[in-house]
């Protein structure tokens, strides 16, 4: 039975040209996390964090994605095109797969809005394949 929940940084905003931390946390389960996949709204994989093998940042994002902190991901040099949904997919044993969702809004530099995850809220979401 899947008992875990994923807490994410929820809906976040950051300024164009700035950076933002995408963060998920799996709780309420004793399952072993074998891998975390970070994915973009359009089927793109940003990065994979394998528990034993470490980080693989996808070639298209190597220049502006940094691993961490922890199992999270730092997105740098933000553009307006980065606005959209991001997903963390936790592969666990024996539970299976949990998924969390983050919505990032990139704001024009001149406009208001917080930098690096300002004005975000936390939500819980779990999903099993």
């Amino acid at each position: 039975m899947m008992t875990g929940t994923i807490e994410t940084t929820g809906n976040i905003s950051a300024k164009k040209g700035g950076s933002v931390i995408l963060q998920c946390h799996l709780s309420s389960t004793m399952a072993q996390v074998t891998q975390v996949n970070w994915e973009q709204h359009d089927h793109s994989l940003l990065a994979i964090r394998n528990a034993e093998l470490g980080w693989h940042i996808y070639p298209a994002f190597k220049d502006r994605v940094a691993p961490g902190p922890g199992l999270g991901l730092t997105l740098q040099s933000l553009t307006m095109n980065d606005t959209g949904e991001y997903f963390c997919t936790y592969h666990t044993y024996p539970d299976g797969t949990y998924r969390g969702r983050i919505f990032l809004e990139v704001l024009e530099s001149s406009g208001g809005g917080g930098a690096g995850g300002g004005g975000h809220h936390h939500h819980h979401h779990h999903h099993h394949h």
Epitope: Q35, N37, H43, L45, E52, H56, Y58
Partner: antibody
Framework: DVQLQESGPDLVKPSQSLSLTCTVT?????????WHWIRQFPGNKLDWMGY???????NYNPSLKSRISITRDTSKNQFFLQLNSVTTEDTATFYC??????????????WGQGTSVTVSS | EIVMTQSHKFMSTSVGDRVSITCKAS??????VAWYQQKPGQSPKLLIY???YRYTGVPDRFTGSGSGTDFTFTISSVQAEDLAVYYC?????????FGGGTKLEIK
């Protein structure tokens, strides 16, 4: 340049253990990467078996977990496959390979030439 | 376990032709796919990783595309030395799996 070379018996009897060696030259298996065993059945199907990480930790295909062991001898720069309780279904060509996870994800960039093992009485 | 299906076991082509080999994943694997070439009597060689990126030294006639569940490997102008079996592999999950292979035959 990195080179991997498999060695071991051509023939193993059913219910016995299959033991293979992969000798790596041109790179120390304790310096980085993960070091894998893959088998190819007659008819070409490829099956990932497991690996030993440069740190010494191991990970196995769940379908083999009760029968497989991967170990290493760092002084000889070798890693080993042991598959227990073999049946004729384990007849295959066995490859050792390297995975550079940071650069290529789960793709294997260097392979040995393979060694063929028949399980038969 | 994610199953990778290469529906064509054999494909026949002529030197200079363009040929495409397909691979279908049983679930969404995003772009976590590699392609290998295995020539007769040899071990597999990595050609493509991350669905569309050529490995070092791979000629640019070899390309990969696709995301999600459907992937394609294309040779833009087949050469005689491309006679081989081509395999896809997924690494989206922690249990890596391969397609059954497509044997490219030169007419």
């Amino acid at each position: 340049d990195v080179q991997l070379q498999e060695s071991g018996p051509d023939l193993v009897k059913p219910s016995q253990s299959l033991s293979l060696t992969c000798t790596v030259t041109g790179y120390s298996i304790t310096s980085g990467y993960s070091w894998h065993w893959i088998r190819q059945f007659p008819g070409n199907k490829l099956d990932w078996m497991g690996y030993v990480h440069y740190s010494g930790s191991t990970n196995y295909n769940p379908s083999l977990k009760s029968r497989i062991s991967i170990t290493r001898d760092t002084s000889k720069n070798q890693f080993f496959l042991q598959l227990n309780s073999v049946t004729t279904e384990d007849t295959a060509t066995f490859y050792c390979a390297r995975m550079d996870y940071g650069n290529y994800g789960g793709a294997m960039d260097y392979w040995g030439q393979g060694t063929s093992v028949t399980v038969s009485s | 376990e994610i199953v990778m299906t290469q529906s064509h076991k054999f494909m026949s082509t002529s030197v200079g032709d363009r040929v495409s080999i397909t691979c279908k994943a049983s679930q969404d694997v995003r772009t976590a796919v590699a392609w290998y070439q295995q020539k007769p009597g040899q071990s597999p060689k990595l050609l493509i990783y991350s669905a569309s990126y050529r490995y070092t030294g791979v000629p640019d006639r070899f390309t990969g595309s696709g995301s999600g569940t459907d992937f394609t490997f294309t040779i833009s102008s087949v050469q005689a030395e491309d006679l081989a079996v081509y395999y896809c592999q997924q690494y989206y999950s922690t249990q890596w799996t391969f397609g059954g292979g497509t044997k490219l035959e030169i007419k």
